[in-house]
Each structure stands twice: as C-alpha cells, then as structure tokens.
C-alpha cells in the first residue's frame, strides 16, 4: 500500500516547563492520522496518542520516569481511517524529534513569592516550592526536590517609591533582606539554574509589594 | 545535637564494590539538609565524593560519576556510599558530611558543618 | 573543575603570633560559597568560616575570612596553642565542590 495520501510532521518541537512536557510538530493532518512513539531507556519504542489529529501529544507521564535520561520520539503518519497503512518500504512515515534530556532542558516555570514577612528591619521572603510531575515512591517532588541545589533564587527587590533595584540569591526558597525602617518595599524573583547551557532562567514571578494582603507586619 | 556516624568494613578486596553507611542521630535526616560523603587520602588533602538531599536528588563528582551511588533510606535515617571496582587508590578515610543553610548576603548557602569521625577503608588483596 | 590553592604549604609560627593564609582558586567564586576548615590530626575537619567572612558557631572572633573572586584569606590574630592544625578552604559553588591542598600551621 502506498502513501500518496500521507506526509511527514515536521517541525518536531519538544515544549516542556516545569516537567509537563509536550511534543508539537506540523502540519495540521488532511485525511492522515498520527501516532507518537517515544524511546525508553531500554531503546524500546513506546506508542502514545495513537491514531489522533491533533499535532501534540503530551508526553509527561514517559519522561518523569528518568527525568535525567534523554529521550527521542518520532511521529508516524496515517492514511485516515487506516493505521494499521505502512509506506512502500513497509513503514509509515515518521519523523524524528530532537533529543531531549528533562533536567537540562524542561523549562523553569515562573515562581511564585508565597509570602513575605517583616520584622523590625529585616523581611523573610519566601518563595513557593512548585510541585512537579515527578514522583518517587508514590508522592510527588516539588522543583527543589528534583533540582536540589542546582536550583537558585534570585530576588529582585526595591522601595515602592523608587526604581533602583537590589538583588539577593539564595540555593534555598527563603530570602532574609535588610530594610529600612517605614518604607514599604515590592519583591519578584526569578528561579535559575546556573549550571545550564540552555534554558537558565525562568520568567520573574509576578511582583508583590508590602502593603498588600501578602503579607505580614511584626514590630 | 545531629551526630553521625560512618559504618562499614575496613577492608575491601580490589575489584569489588566499597559499601558504607552513615547514620544520622539526634535529628531527621528529611529536615531540608544535604548530605554528603568526602574522602581523605593517606597523608594528603579531602576530596567530595558526592552528596544526596532527602528526596534522592544527587550531585557527584564527575571524577568518580561512573562508579559512585549514594542513596538514603528516610525510615532508617541513614545515607549510603557505594563506589565500585576499587583498587588500591580507594584506599582512604571516608567521612560522611551534613550541608545546612547558612545565612550570608540575603540568602542560604550550604556548607558541611557536622562531620562523622571518619573511618578507614583499606583497599588490598 | 575549580581549583583552589593554598600557600604557604606549612606556616610555623609561635603561640601568640598571627597567623595569615592565602587561597586563590582558579577561576572566580562567589564570597557565598567560600569556606574554611580547620583539621587536626586524627579528627575530622571542622567548619570555622563560611561565606569567605562569615564565623560558624561557636568559632572565636581570633579567626577571620575575607577575599573575593579569586584570593581569599584566612587570617588568626593571636595563635593559640589549639590552633595548630591543618587548615583547608572549599569552594561549594561549582560541581564537583573542592578543597585546597591545606595549610599546615605548625609550632616554631
């Protein structure tokens, strides 16, 4: 059976934060259909998202197995209504993704400050530990608990009443920053992982300033 | 006050696999530590082997990567050292190490405070 | 890897005296992850000083770090009969984390 009706994806295209992780490829299916294989780490391939139209299949639930092993994937093509179609050398068409390592590469989802506190001169800024979709005997693992102290913290913060910015680092989720006294101050940290080539820096946290609901006051 | 404490057989035969334990006393090895093993040549400087947090997630020295495995069993608050195909250049003291945050600058950094005593591993036929 | 270098290799000096120790690491690290340790024989290492100036609890004011980038050090005003030991600087910013080849600080 030929495939006259089929072509190639192309555009192969992982999409990954935080470790839910997606693969995307092109074009949009005309009479054709796709199915995702993804190699394990015994180089076997596994099917995923058989027979389906859309152009990405999630792919989470394989790569949080060995967030640290690199994977490949490749997307069969279809005649529609006819998976079971092979090409004249008795093989669908497929294209080959990238490889694709999670711990170096998934992206670094924006944080989120989950509170701040002062007392006298001093605010405790504390950043959410964002859980993730890896799991290790039956519980989920936050970011910290995967990264470890590959992942650091940078704050960014300044007084509401001017623009100069000062920064703190941290390898842990907690932030402990002088300030003076009566002045009300705004916070956003970034997460980083400066040991990367790609893929360093998440985007800034939304910013939250002193004042608001967020957080709390303690002479 | 966390004490630890290495444990293992002084004597290993070159070519098999070096296997030590360190237990940690007097606090939860799941408190938002790491912890580390470190080793000390004969008559000479320390060298990190490698380090573990609770969760299992670890960092080794790429010098010894392909032969390292460090593990933690939280329910017996211990740590484990496993270097395989050891020859006599293995032959060290072997200290077990807890990284706590440190306050500097704003933030936490880690740094090995608490030190096992230390226990020597000698590797011969 | 970083490496750290420390000299003089053996310092010999007199109880009282003040003791300088020099470590200058290969390429630059961060004040945050620079530590020292003092060693004595048959004894594991202790941690006196953390963030290139920061003294580890119950450390005595007689021991200070300073340093950035690439030279740090280790300086005891008054030498005490305890102080005689190895000391060791460590550098834990940069996989794999590594120690100097120590200092040895010895009775003249």
């Known amino acids: 059976s030929g495939t006259t009706n089929t072509v190639a994806a192309y555009n192969l295209t992982w999409k990954s934060t935080n470790f839910k992780t997606i693969l995307e490829w092109e074009p949009k299916p005309v009479n054709q259909v796709y199915t995702v294989q993804i190699s394990d780490r015994s180089r076997n391939w596994k099917y995923k998202c058989t027979g389906t139209t859309d152009t990405e299949c999630d792919l989470t639930d394989e790569i949080v197995k060995d967030v640290n092993w690199t994977y490949e994937a490749r997307v069969l093509s279809y005649p529609a209504g006819n998976v079971e179609s092979t090409g004249s050398a008795g093989e669908p068409l497929y294209e080959n993704s990238p490889e694709f390592t999670p711990y170096l590469e998934t992206n670094l989802g924006q944080p989120t400050i989950q509170s701040f506190e002062q007392v006298g001169t001093k605010v405790n800024v504390t950043v959410e530990d964002e859980r993730t979709l890896v799991r290790r005997n039956n519980t989920f693992l936050s970011l910290r608990d995967v990264f470890g102290k590959d992942l650091i913290y940078t704050l960014y913060y300044w007084k509401s009443s001017s623009s100069g910015k000062k920064t703190a680092k941290t390898n842990t989720n907690e932030f402990l920053i002088d300030v003076d006294k009566g002045e009300n101050y705004c916070f956003s940290v970034q997460a980083v992982i400066p040991s990367r080539t790609v893929n360093r820096k998440s985007t800034d946290s939304p910013v939250e300033c002193m004042g608001q609901e967020k957080g709390e006051f303690r002479e | 006050q966390v004490q630890l404490q290495e444990s293992g057989p002084g004597l290993v035969k070159p070519s098999q696999t070096l296997s030590l334990t360190c237990t940690v006393s007097?606090?939860?090895?799941?408190?938002?530590?790491?912890w580390s093993w470190i080793r000390q040549h004969p008559g000479k400087g320390l060298e990190w082997i490698g380090e573990?947090?609770?969760?299992?997630?670890?960092r080794y020295n790429p010098s010894l990567k392909s032969r390292v495995t460090i593990s933690v069993d939280t329910s017996k608050n211990q740590f484990s050292l496993k270097l395989s195909s050891v020859t006599a250049a293995d032959t060290a003291v072997y200290y077990c190490?807890?990284?706590?945050?440190?306050?500097?600058?704003?933030?936490?950094?880690?740094?090995?405070?608490?030190w096992g005593k230390g226990t020597t591993v000698t590797v011969s036929s | 890897e970083i490496v750290l270098t420390q000299s003089p290799g053996t310092l010999s000096l007199s109880p009282g005296e003040r003791a300088t120790l020099s470590c200058r690491a290969s390429q630059s690290v961060s004040s945050s992850y620079l530590a020292w340790y003092q060693q004595k024989p048959g004894q594991a290492p202790r941690l006196l000083i953390y963030g290139a100036s920061s003294r580890a609890t119950g450390i005595p004011d007689r021991f200070s770090g300073s340093g950035s980038g690439t030279d740090f050090t280790l300086t005891i005003s008054r030498l005490e009969p305890e102080d005689f030991a190895v000391y060791y600087c460590?550098?834990?910013?940069?996989?794999?984390?590594?120690f100097g080849g120590g200092t040895k600080v010895e009775i003249k």
């Open positions: 007097g606090g939860s090895i799941s408190s938002g530590q790491y």
């Open positions: 573990i947090y609770y969760s299992g997630s670890t």
């Open positions: 460590q550098q834990v910013g940069v996989v794999p984390y590594t």
């Open positions: 190490a807890r990284d706590t945050p440190y306050y500097y600058d704003g933030g936490y950094y880690y740094y090995m405070d608490v």
